[in-house]
């Protein structure tokens, strides 16, 4: 067991042309934090694959606001080390991913305002117990400077943290078969401590805390006999008639692996390959922690420091699900009204509105009449984001500023003559017609098509159009 430690020294623009824009602005102040993911071996695995050696999240850095016009400086960093504890042996070769995240502090719509700023990855050889190793990695125009080391947690020592050391029981020498622990010469290598309760007769261990069974025995503590027969066949009980030909239960028969684990036979016993969220000799221990790297697609794991406390994955834009395993289009929720375009900018959603609409969600029909008085007594009528003036008699045009000729449209029917009047128009009807627009014929007997002429007006008199 031990701890991988990562110290971030600086994160800022790299050398050369094309300095990056500051990730924070006066409009959107932000702060940085880091995530490290470790995997054993020199793997070329995708960034989304599990962090089998462990993962860790830094604290948030100080709030930073860009100075207008200034190039992006080295950005203020979180305090302290990132520490990734490892339970088993240190593998010696490992792959790392270090992600730089920004947390924006402005008012954001659509969830936590987190976005991935840079991601660097590498493969390294490193012996536990050695000095700090320094490294520089570039991601686009950004540069990350950091140091790292792996150290064993007492009582483990050695380049893989597999040797255990105990204080000497005698001042001069270690016990039989046990060497002094270099460089701690005053301590002695200790025998491996197997899993508590592991049968001393039928079990053994090659790593601290495990319990491997000798042939013929099974169970987590090697206390369950595989066979009741003394048959010499390694596969178990004999038959009275056929001798030792009947296959008996092998170490994987009946699948000793719990919780969906898969069993494979080993020379002395069996081995369980556990699904995510379970571990232990028989996959009997549950409780995923953030160290297990349960969040996919760059999701950030929060809480879950120990198996008894739940973890939460905070997903980046475009992903959802308890482990950020599902791709999602946040715009599919159609947050923009009135046909606006939804743009998922990562840190926020933005709606770009069609003409005539406004507001964060295009929810406002623009009041085009505001501040746009129609001249000469006209009244403004809204509709679809465009304004229209209903003009008083004698005026026309978009804003009723043009003097209108009321006779231009030839409003008088049946050859009536039109006269412009201060309040509209007057039709002088041809003989045989009457009405405001000369639209009614006068019948030969003197009666008109109208029920009655208005008082004071004779058929054929000019009719004023009101």
């Amino acid at each position: 067991a031990g701890v991988f430690e990562l110290q971030i020294h600086s994160f800022g623009p790299g050398p050369g042309p094309g300095a990056p824009r500051s990730p924070c602005s006066a409009r959107l102040p932000c702060r940085l934090f880091f995530r490290v993911c470790l995997k054993p071996g020199l793997s070329e695995e995708a960034a989304e694959s599990p962090c089998a050696l462990g993962a860790a999240l830094s604290a948030r850095g100080p709030v930073y606001t860009e100075q207008p016009g200034a190039p992006a400086p080295d950005l203020p960093l979180p305090d302290g080390l990132l520490q990734v504890p490892f339970r088993d042996a240190w593998p010696g070769t490992f792959s790392f991913i270090i992600e730089t995240w920004r947390e924006e502090l402005g008012d954001q719509i659509g969830g936590p305002a987190w976005s991935l700023l840079a991601r660097v990855a590498g493969r390294r050889r490193l012996a536990a117990g050695g000095p700090w190793a320094r490294d520089i990695q570039r991601a686009g125009a950004w540069e990350l400077r950091f140091s790292y080391r792996a150290r064993c947690e007492p009582p483990a020592v050695g380049t893989a943290c597999t040797r255990l050391c105990r204080p000497r029981s005698a001042p001069s020498r270690c016990g039989p078969g046990l060497r002094p622990c270099a460089p701690l010469e005053d301590e002695c290598e200790a025998p491996l401590v197997c899993r508590a309760g592991c049968s001393p007769e039928h079990g053994f261990c090659e790593q601290p805390g495990e319990c491997r069974c000798l042939e013929g025995w099974t169970g987590p503590l090697c206390t369950v006999p595989v066979s009741t027969s003394s048959c010499l066949s390694p596969r178990g009980p004999s038959s009275a008639t056929t001798g030792c030909l009947v296959p008996g239960p092998g170490p994987c028969d009946g699948n000793p692996c719990a919780n969906g684990g898969s069993c494979s036979e080993t020379p002395r016993s069996f081995e369980c390959t556990c699904p995510r969220g379970f571990y232990g000799l028989r996959c009997e221990v549950s409780g995923v922690t953030c160290a297990d790297g349960p969040c996919f697609n760059g999701g950030l794991c929060v809480g879950g420091a120990d198996p008894d406390s739940a973890y939460i994955c905070h997903c980046p834009p475009g992903f959802q699900g308890s482990n950020c395993e599902k791709r999602v289009d946040r715009c599919s929720l159609q947050p923009c009204r009135n046909g606006g375009l939804c743009l998922d900018l990562g840190h926020a959603l933005r709606c770009r509105c069609r003409a005539g609409f406004a507001g964060p969600r295009c929810e406002h029909d623009l009041d085009d009449c505001a501040g746009r008085a129609c001249a000469n007594g006209g009244t403004c009528v809204e509709g679809g984001g465009a304004h229209r003036c209903s003009c008083a008699l004698g005026f026309g045009g978009r804003d009723c500023r043009e003097r209108a000729d009321p006779c231009a449209a030839r409003p008088c029917a049946h050859g009536g003559r039109c006269y412009a009047h201060f309040s509209g128009l007057v039709c002088a009807c041809a003989p045989g017609y009457m009405g405001a627009r000369c639209e009614f014929p006068v019948h030969p007997d003197g009666a008109s098509a109208l029920p009655a002429a208005p008082p004071g007006l004779r058929p054929g008199d000019p009719q004023r159009y009101l």
């Epitope: 207008p68 686009g140 599919s332 375009l341 743009l343 069609r354 003409a355 609409f357």
Partner: antibody
Framework: EVQLLESGGGLVQPGGSLRLSCAAS????????MNWVRQAPGKGLEWVST????????YYADSVKGRFTISRDNSKNTLYLQMNSLRAEDTAVFYC???????????????WGQGTLVTVSS | DIQMTQSPSAMSASVGDRVTITCRAS??????LAWFQQKPGKVPKRLIY???SLQSGVPSRFSGSGSGTEFTLTISSLQPEDFATYFC?????????FGGGTKVEIK
Amino acid sequence: EVQLLESGGGLVQPGGSLRLSCAASGFTFSSYAMNWVRQAPGKGLEWVSTISGSGGSTYYADSVKGRFTISRDNSKNTLYLQMNSLRAEDTAVFYCAIDPEYYDILTGGDYWGQGTLVTVSS
Amino acid sequence: DIQMTQSPSAMSASVGDRVTITCRASQGISNYLAWFQQKPGKVPKRLIYAASSLQSGVPSRFSGSGSGTEFTLTISSLQPEDFATYFCLQHDSFPLTFGGGTKVEIK
């Protein structure tokens, strides 16, 4: 690095049709709204059309509405512009471009393609 | 529709001059404005986004300012490679609209 490459331009008679394509690489194509912009010879730039990342929302300039159709195939990282009932005034270099809203998110590469010339003439 | 009025439409200047180009929006567009440079036969190159943020890789002699309806592109000291046509673009709302362009020529 972001790259956009248009194709499909050429000479077509008035009333004819053409389909432009834009192959995208270097970014998660389906996450970004895309635009077509055109430039008539010796003239300024004119926005033609926009499509959302999912392809579910489309927008057109009045001058092309009803004649042009923008679409995308996210599985092929390709943007399209189907142009029907072409007119002489549609003669232009057509550019596909990542929506300007994302200029502060993406950093490297070209946000505009090199353009493809469409000539409408009899 | 939002009209973008760009001025001047053309100008002559010398190397080392300070050059200012203006774009005026017919209505407020917050800071949803980008500036482009285009040379003959070439693709428009983005210079400024969000009205005042310098695009990565663009020389610092270029700067943008303004918000709402008045926007300015400034070249603090004109260089030989800066002779080109400059366009503004509003992307506040549809339809997206470009300014008419400003051609910067050698005096």
